[in-house]
């Protein structure tokens, strides 16, 4: 399973995929939206 | 100023597949995922996913069972959303739609104009 | 998942009086003291536009007779005092967990 997280502390497991929070504006990956720190690095 | 631009209205038979694009400008393409919603005619929004422009990474709502397929060219900033085996039920209008984050010190939503999809035999 | 479900879904309401609209999870969407809830405004023939996120903080440029409470399952969207361009179908919508979800959606009206 993949994990989702917020720079909150909330997580989840959903789907074959990997999330997780970077600090906003770093160049690993795309901000998702609507999160805290949610950003997709996969 | 960001823009998002999608595609023109598609009439479309039962069963037969539509791909949808959003053309996206006024920011580096690669930092925001790109999402998808739709309208039914007359009626609420349904969230469909997302995909990654910098990855190519994609979530699905998983009521689409395998129909939809998010990607994204790099070459020309435009994401790509299809979906197949359509029925009637998915005339609606296909929203792309770009989102900040809540830590960003500003939050702000960017729409593409919408592309009405028609499913009739 | 998580089901959105707003009350009432429509509203009558004159000029200059005040319009609550609630929205209601069937399980919590705060983590960490957040709610990931949202409320959206949308006008006919146009794309919805966010008018509060994390349940109470106004969007960019986002006028202040809009406002947004609530915590964890229960949520209220309220226009203090409502003017002509209002008139539109409201939507929240918890960015919690995947799928996202919508509420069905609240039309406001002038009486």
């Known amino acids: 399973d993949a994990e989702f997280r917020h720079d909150s502390g909330y997580e989840v497991h959903h789907q074959k995929l990997v999330f997780f929070a970077e600090d906003v504006g770093s160049n690993k990956g795309a901000i998702i939206g609507l999160m805290v720190g949610g950003v997709v690095i996969a | 100023q960001v823009q998002l631009v999608q595609s023109g209205a598609e009439v479309k038979k039962p069963g037969a597949s539509v791909k949808v694009s959003c053309k996206a400008s006024?920011?580096?393409?690669?930092?925001?995922?790109i999402h998808w919603v739709r309208q039914a005619p007359g009626q609420g929004l349904e969230w469909m996913g997302f995909t990654s422009p910098y990855s190519g990474v994609s979530n699905y709502n998983q009521k689409f069972k395998g129909r939809v397929t998010m990607t994204r060219d790099t070459s020309t900033s435009t994401v790509y959303m299809e979906l197949s085996s359509l029925r009637s039920e998915d005339t609606a209008v296909y929203y792309c739609?770009?989102?900040?984050?809540?830590?960003?010190?500003?939050?702000?939503?960017?729409w593409g104009q919408g592309t009405l999809v028609t499913v009739s035999s | 998942d998580i089901v959105m479900t707003q009350s009432p879904d429509s509203l009558a309401v004159s000029l200059g009086e005040r319009a609550t609209i609630n929205c209601r999870a069937s399980e919590s969407v705060d983590n960490d003291r957040i709610s990931f809830l949202n409320w959206y405004q949308q006008k006919p023939g146009q794309p919805p536009k966010l008018l509060i996120y994390?349940?109470?903080k106004q969007g960019t440029g986002v006028p202040d007779r809009f406002s947004g409470s609530g915590s964890g399952t229960d949520f209220t969207l309220t226009i203090s005092s409502l003017q002509a361009e209002d008139v539109a179908v409201y939507y929240c919508q918890q960015s919690k967990e995947f799928p996202w979800s919508f509420g069905g959606g609240t039309k406001v009206e002038i009486k």
């Open positions: 994390a349940a109470t």
């Open positions: 006024g920011y580096t393409f690669t930092t925001y995922a």
């Open positions: 739609a770009r989102f900040d984050n809540y830590d960003q010190g500003y939050v702000r939503d960017y």
